[in-house]
């Protein structure tokens, strides 16, 4: 397979971004993936010194289908209540806004999107000492921004001062059509402690009006990791596969696009009773990665080690008890079969995928399950050629993989 083309920006190029980035110990990494392989067989990834990751992320509006794989909701259960369109029920499709990754500053070519990521924005990753340059373009119709939960050192790229009249950068709205450049620096305080997993599961969102921005769809995963982290065997390692799972109750009643969705999908917008409890209930989507009723179907390879970065973010106000049927997982050095997630939090677990078959990923809250908060997990043998072609170029590959949200496939 061809090696991914990776451009290491030199110091002169880096000046285009910020004086801080001319440190010779810092690599600024950008990516061209026209010839990238479909999967990369690798376990070990580590780096010798901090990197600066450059991400081009846009907020974009699109119609989101919560249940693309549910062809015809059956007449029983909650399925039809939440998925079927009716004279006073919007159904399964809603206009939403998403974080989308682009290849460069032109914002013309989108990065590849995996179905499994669902509504989530691109996976952002940083180790302690790393810097993430977020080139954010608001391609939506109303003001949004992008801000991390879990990184404390966040500032505008070009200035140490916040824009006039803004107390905190997370409150600063980026207007439609505008580009704003952020510099996120991962500090020691942000990173995992010795008792934490290798990577902390965090998130980023728009914070202009967090409740409504989130209800509208702006959420993405952020991993904050040990510097040059190792696995239990002392190897500098990433797992075979990393899976980001977002348990989220999207309250479409709080979305900025509710009025537009009513106008587009209902016959008599003025006649809709917004306070009708049944109408409101039909707009509350109990989702995993933005999918309901098993529309999210994950695949992992038998015998691989899978890391799961699990978030609970949305309108749910109580804790969630999450399970993988057929599996236990390791969480904080203890094997468990249920993971407790508090609102607006994330946890990291891993497991060895030793049970083949089709399994359920869901939560113990039966009300949430009945309303669609379930996904399927298929564990099966994967026949892929083994090889160590990339063994000596782990550093470049890590940069490539981590920026692209590509799955790391097993040996």
């Amino acid at each position: 397979p061809e090696e991914p083309q990776l451009r290491m920006k030199n110091n002169e190029e880096a000046e285009d971004y910020d004086d801080d980035l001319t440190d010779s110990e810092m690599d600024v990494v950008r990516f061209d993936d026209d010839n990238s392989p479909s999967f990369i067989q690798i376990r070990s990834v580590a780096k010798k010194h901090p990197k600066t990751w450059v991400h081009y992320i846009a907020a974009e509006e699109e119609d989101w289908d919560y249940a693309p794989l549910v062809l015809a909701p059956d007449d029983r259960s909650y399925k039809s209540q939440y998925l079927n369109n009716g004279p006073q029920r919007i159904g399964r499709k809603y206009k939403k806004v998403r974080f989308m990754a682009y290849t460069d500053e032109t914002f013309k070519t989108r990065e590849a999107i995996q179905h499994e990521s669902g509504i989530l924005g691109p996976l952002l990753y940083g180790e302690v000492g790393d810097t993430l340059l977020i080139i954010f373009k608001n391609q939506a119709s109303r003001p949004y921004n992008i801000y991390p939960h879990g990184i404390t050192d966040v500032r505008p790229l070009y200035s140490r001062r916040l824009p006039k009249g803004v107390k905190h950068l997370k409150d600063f709205p980026i207007l439609p059509g505008e580009i704003f450049k952020y510099k996120w620096t991962v500090t020691v305080e942000d990173g995992p402690t010795k008792s934490d997993p290798r990577c902390l599961t965090r998130y980023y969102s728009s914070f202009v009006n967090m409740e409504r921005d989130l209800a509208s769809g702006l959420i993405g995963p952020l991993l904050i990791c040990y510097k040059e982290s190792v696995d239990q065997r002392g190897n500098q390692i990433m797992s075979d596969k990393r899976n980001v799972i977002l348990f989220s109750v999207f309250d479409e009643n709080r979305s900025w696009y509710l009025t537009e969705n009513i106008q587009r999908f209902l016959p008599n917008p003025a006649g809709v009773q917004l306070e009708d409890p049944e109408f409101q209930a039909s707009n509350i989507m109990h989702s995993i990665n933005g999918y309901v009723f098993d529309s999210l179907q994950l695949s992992v390879c038998l015998h691989e080690v899978a890391y799961w970065y699990i978030l609970s973010i949305g309108a749910q106000t109580d804790f969630l008890s999450v399970f993988f049927s057929g599996y236990t997982f390791k969480h904080k050095m203890v094997y468990e079969d249920t993971l407790t997630l508090f609102p607006f939090s994330g946890e990291t677990v891993f497991m060895s995928m030793e049970n083949p078959g089709l399994w359920i990923l869901g939560c113990h809250n039966s009300d949430f399950r009945n309303r669609g908060m379930t996904a399927l997990l298929k564990v099966s043998s994967c026949d892929k050629n083994t090889g160590d072609y990339y063994e000596d170029s782990y550093e470049d590959i890590s940069a490539y993989l981590l920026s692209k949200n590509n799955a790391i496939e097993p040996r």
């Epitope: 369109n85 009716g86 004279p87 006073q88 209902l266 008599n268 917008p269």
Partner: antibody
């Protein structure tokens, strides 16, 4: 007052095309969707689908996908039903009906379409 | 799709009487059932929606009840102009579906 005036009866041969109009008055046309309902001779009512008068997007019931097309002329507050490649079983009276959020609150008088060779 | 079973299909009554027409849905449709009156040479008329809400301009002798799967239209003290065809229709979800109709005739 709110009313709908539909075009007159049509006599067509199999394979031909018919286009029925439904002119609305007495309300803001784009505030309400328009439903189409079929009633075959001696039969009950069958919902064909609706068109969103705000966006122009049609939704068809499964039995009416393919040969049937809903359209609008918003400036004239008029909705249209076109049936292509007419078949004998299309012989029926076709009604337009305003779509409120709760039901079809006002109906046209119906347009009779007869398909016969 | 939601199937609607309407009964009876035929009903004979005299002016002044009270009659009931029933509709049953194949699954719960909450309160979302409407009733229509069809008369020759007249446009179809919405009588009741959301199970029991009387459409404006409809006489109070018409009433609707029920929720879930079972619904009833009651016409009390029948008037001569009430003899017509009656249809129920669920407006819970698309595709909208109708009952087969009840013909109310003069005894």
């Amino acid at each position: 007052q709110i009313q709908f005036v539909q075009s007159g009866p049509e006599l067509k041969k199999p394979g031909e095309t018919v286009k029925i109009s439904c002119k609305a008055s007495g309300y803001t046309f784009t505030n309400y969707g328009m439903n189409w309902v079929k009633q075959a001779p001696g039969k009950g009512l069958k919902w064909m689908g609706w068109i969103n008068s705000y966006t122009g997007e049609p939704t068809y019931a499964d039995d009416f996908k393919g040969r049937f097309a809903f359209s609008l002329e918003t400036s004239a507050s008029t909705a249209y039903l076109q049936i292509n490649n007419l078949k004998n079983e299309d012989t029926a009276t076709y009604f337009c009906a305003r779509g409120a959020s709760y039901a079809m609150d006002y109906w046209g008088q119906g347009t009779s379409v007869t398909v016969s060779s | 799709d939601v199937q609607i079973t309407q009964s009876p299909s035929y009903l004979a009554a005299s002016p002044g009487e009270t009659i009931t027409i029933n509709c049953r849905a194949s699954k719960s449709i909450s309160k979302y059932l409407a009733w229509y009156q069809e008369k020759p040479v007249k446009t179809n008329k919405l009588l009741i929606y959301s199970g029991s809400t009387l459409q404006s301009g409809i006489p109070s002798r018409f009433s609707g009840s029920g929720s879930g799967t079972d619904f009833t239209l009651t016409i009390s003290s029948l008037e001569p102009e009430d003899f017509a065809m009656y249809y129920c229709q669920q407006h819970y979800e698309y595709p909208l579906t109708f009952g087969a109709g009840t013909k109310l005739e003069l005894k």
